[in-house]
């Protein structure tokens, strides 16, 4: 395929592999994909450090890379026609394996907007500088390359493989060699964590003599979220060494018998697991599994636990985290209910105030009460509100309908009220006549 697995780092529930080879981004992704992974994500500073570690491992084994500034593909790409979004940490790029946008980014320089071709991201390594945790590889954006033409300074790529869980490395209580074969077809003798479904071949012996024993184990799920090999007791034990070789392969304490045999044991507060090697805390609450203010409560025999929430909170679907109880769903208030963290409060609608019989009750506010009326003239209280009225010759005015404004009867909608002259007055009007004319008894006509 033009790529060699040179390095592997397994941590948490993922393994990262670094490969050297001048491949295009598509070829690199295809290589990762064939073994069940994707080009690596770098979604946090922690993940950036894992990727840096696997690259450092690769560089220690790689004789000489051709470019001082070497680039390694990761799984961040932007499709053709999708434009740059400077407001986002990933600038419109997305991870090839899918998943949400993440806040972490480490761009090498300001990105140029270009929507006409697909763009891919690589990690930029300055090989003249040592790789330090404080100096994480920068993200460099550019063309994705094509078969035979990977792009300038592309020296390899990083894959990521995710797993249900990991097994602890097998502990040898005497001379021997363990070889792990991972589901992504990498063989290694030194893994900090070994992914689920890996095989382990154990060859016991000094190496120069014929090997006396060999064992085969699979990393499997022994019980929910418990990943183990199913081996019982330390492997390759030798009376010649007793507890002196690798602490007898024991996780904590090793106790020797007089006949060269030995047993593993645990410190106070821990118990020996079925593998007779590993120790686990007796108190499952010691790992603080409960979140969000939840208290960890031990179950019978101290084997299990449940999480308990404070007043006004309840466990979410994970049964580990506390979420606020929405007390308003039970309609405890007469009118408005406002949910608050750990509780609730009742509020009244406009025109009502707290009061009356019962918890959370509301009563009408008498807006027309003495000294309180918002109206310029007449005020009538209603349930939850009020309305203003005006004396004859005035109409309600103002944005809130509380003011009274004189009606200009001289420009009334029915046309002129007077035959000749019309004089508007506060709340009324009167008619007049031109010189030589007299106002008739009806107060409207001129004679």
């Amino acid at each position: 395929t033009g790529a060699d697995t040179e390095a592997v780092v397994c941590v948490g529930t993922a393994c990262y592999t670094a490969h050297s080879g001048k491949l295009s981004a598509a070829e690199a992704q295809n290589h990762c994909n064939q073994n069940g992974g994707n080009l690596a994500t770098v979604k946090s500073k922690e993940e950036a450090q894992h990727v840096q570690r696997v690259l450092a491992q690769l560089l220690r084994r790689e004789a000489a890379l051709t470019a001082r500034m070497s680039k390694f593909w990761i799984g961040l790409q932007r499709e053709k026609g999708k434009c740059l979004d400077p407001s986002l940490p990933l600038k419109g790029f997305s991870w090839v394996g899918g998943g949400e946008d993440t806040p972490y980014s480490n761009w090498h320089k300001e990105l140029r907007n270009s929507c006409i071709s697909k763009r891919c991201v690589s990690l930029l390594l300055d090989l003249s500088q040592p790789l330090l945790p404080s100096r994480l590889p920068k993200w460099s954006e550019g063309p994705c390359g094509s078969p035979g033409s990977p792009g300038s300074n592309i020296e390899g790529f990083v894959c990521k493989f995710s797993f249900k869980g990991m097994c602890r490395p097998l502990a040898l209580g005497g001379p021997g060699q363990v070889t792990y074969t991972t589901p992504f077809q990498t063989t290694s003798s030194s893994l900090e964590a070994v992914p689920f479904a890996s095989a382990a071949n154990v060859a016991c012996g000094e190496g120069d003599k014929d090997e006396t024993q060999s064992h085969y184990f699979l990393c499997k799920e022994k019980a929910p979220d418990v990943f183990d090999w199913g081996s019982s007791g330390p492997l390759c034990v030798s009376p010649k060494y007793g507890c002196n070789f690798n602490n007898g392969g024991c996780h904590q304490d090793c106790f020797e018998g007089g006949d060269g045999s030995f047993l593993c044991g645990c410190r106070p507060g821990f118990r020996l697991l079925d593998d007779l090697v590993t120790c686990a805390s007796r108190n499952p609450c010691s790992s603080s599994p409960c979140r969000g203010g939840a208290t960890c409560v031990l179950g019978p025999h101290g084997k299990n636990y449940t999480c308990r929430c404070p007043q006004g909170y309840q466990l979410d679907s994970s049964q580990l985290d506390c979420v606020d109880v929405d007390e308003c769903q039970d309609s405890p208030c007469a009118q408005e209910c406002v949910n608050t963290p750990g509780g609730f409060r009742c509020e009244c609608w406009v025109g009502y105030e707290p009061g009356g019989p019962g918890e959370g009750a509301c009563q009408d506010v008498d807006e027309c009460a003495l000294g309180r009326s918002p109206c310029a003239q007449g005020c009538t209280n209603t349930d939850g509100s009020f309305h203003c009225s005006c004396e004859e010759g005035y109409v309600l005015a103002g944005e809130d309908g509380t003011q009274c404004q004189d009606v200009d009867e001289c420009v009334g909608p029915g046309g002129p009220l007077c035959d000749s002259l019309c004089f508007n007055t506060q709340g009324s009007f009167h008619c007049g006549c031109l010189p030589g004319w007299v106002l008739a008894p009806n107060g409207v006509s001129c004679t």
């Epitope: 479904a197 699979l218 499997k220 929910p224 084997k303 299990n304 636990y305």
Partner: antibody, heavy 118, light 112 residues
Framework: QVQLVQSGPEVKKPGESLKISCKAS????????LNWVRQMPGKGLEWMGR????????DYNGKFKGQVTISADKSSGTAYLQLSSLKASDTAVYFC???????????WGQGTLVTVSS | DIVMTQSPLSLPVTPGEPASISCRFS???????????LYWYLQKPGQSPQLLIY???NLASGVPDRFSGSGSGTDFTLKISRVEAEDVGVYYC?????????FGGGTKLEIK
């Protein structure tokens, strides 16, 4: 489709031993736990033990340890339950059951009736 | 070992009526991953048991939706919304959180 086919009924005398088989098909035999469950006449279900055929790893219920041996042959996709020093109280139906990825016992064999009588 | 108590021992039901079976465990079956490892099986007369509910509330493939499972860390309930004649048999609850796996004593559902 997934199938577990068990060997036929057995009648044994006290003190004898017996090996029941369970032939699996329709799934990756090596990658799933294979359990054995006992049901005494008119009684409930009891988990006896299990095997992971991929590497032969076994776990036993303490109640049955020493009396039963579980084994598997990857090449033929067959699991075995060996019962030694049979007693009348071993008279029961023995089921082989696949354990799935949700820790459920999702596929059951038809059961093998073992009668121990002098 | 985790011990469970199933009740009632026997449950006579009229077809079309609902039915409810309880199961109580000696310790919580809630794992720190948020999953409850409680299962329900039905053994019809003369047959092998069959899986009904996995991980407390999930319906197994091919099981009618009149069956439902619920509960907390130690107390669980299997409900049948409307019992049908084909539902007769012995119902078992089981835990697969901690070895050895254990089953409840069983509840015999019969038609009135």
């Amino acid at each position: 489709q997934v199938q577990l086919v068990q060997s036929g009924p057995e009648v044994k005398k006290p003190g004898e031993s017996l090996k029941i088989s369970c032939k699996a098909s329709g799934y990756a035999f090596s990658s799933y736990w294979l359990n054995w469950v006992r049901q005494m006449p008119g009684k409930g279900l009891e988990w006896m033990g299990r095997i992971y055929p991929g590497d032969g790893d076994t776990d036993y219920n303490g109640k049955f340890k020493g009396q039963v041996t579980i084994s598997a042959d990857k090449s033929s996709g067959t699991a075995y339950l060996q019962l030694s020093s049979l007693k009348a109280s071993d008279t029961a139906v023995y089921f082989c059951v696949r354990g799935d990825g949700y820790w459920a016992m999702d596929y059951w064999g038809q059961g093998t009736l073992v009668t121990v009588s002098s | 070992d985790i011990v469970m108590t199933q009740s009632p021992l026997s449950l006579p039901v009229t077809p079309g009526e609902p039915a409810s079976i309880s199961c109580r465990f000696s310790q919580s079956l809630l794992h720190s991953n948020g999953i409850t490892y409680l299962y329900w099986y039905l053994q019809k007369p003369g047959q092998s048991p069959q899986l009904l509910i996995y991980q407390m509330s999930n319906l197994a493939s091919g099981v009618p939706d009149r069956f439902s499972g619920s509960g907390s860390g130690t107390d669980f309930t299997l409900k049948i919304s409307r019992v049908e004649a084909e539902d007769v048999g012995v119902y078992y609850c089981a835990q697969n959180l901690e070895l050895p796996w254990t089953f409840g004593g069983g509840t015999k559902l019969e038609i009135k």
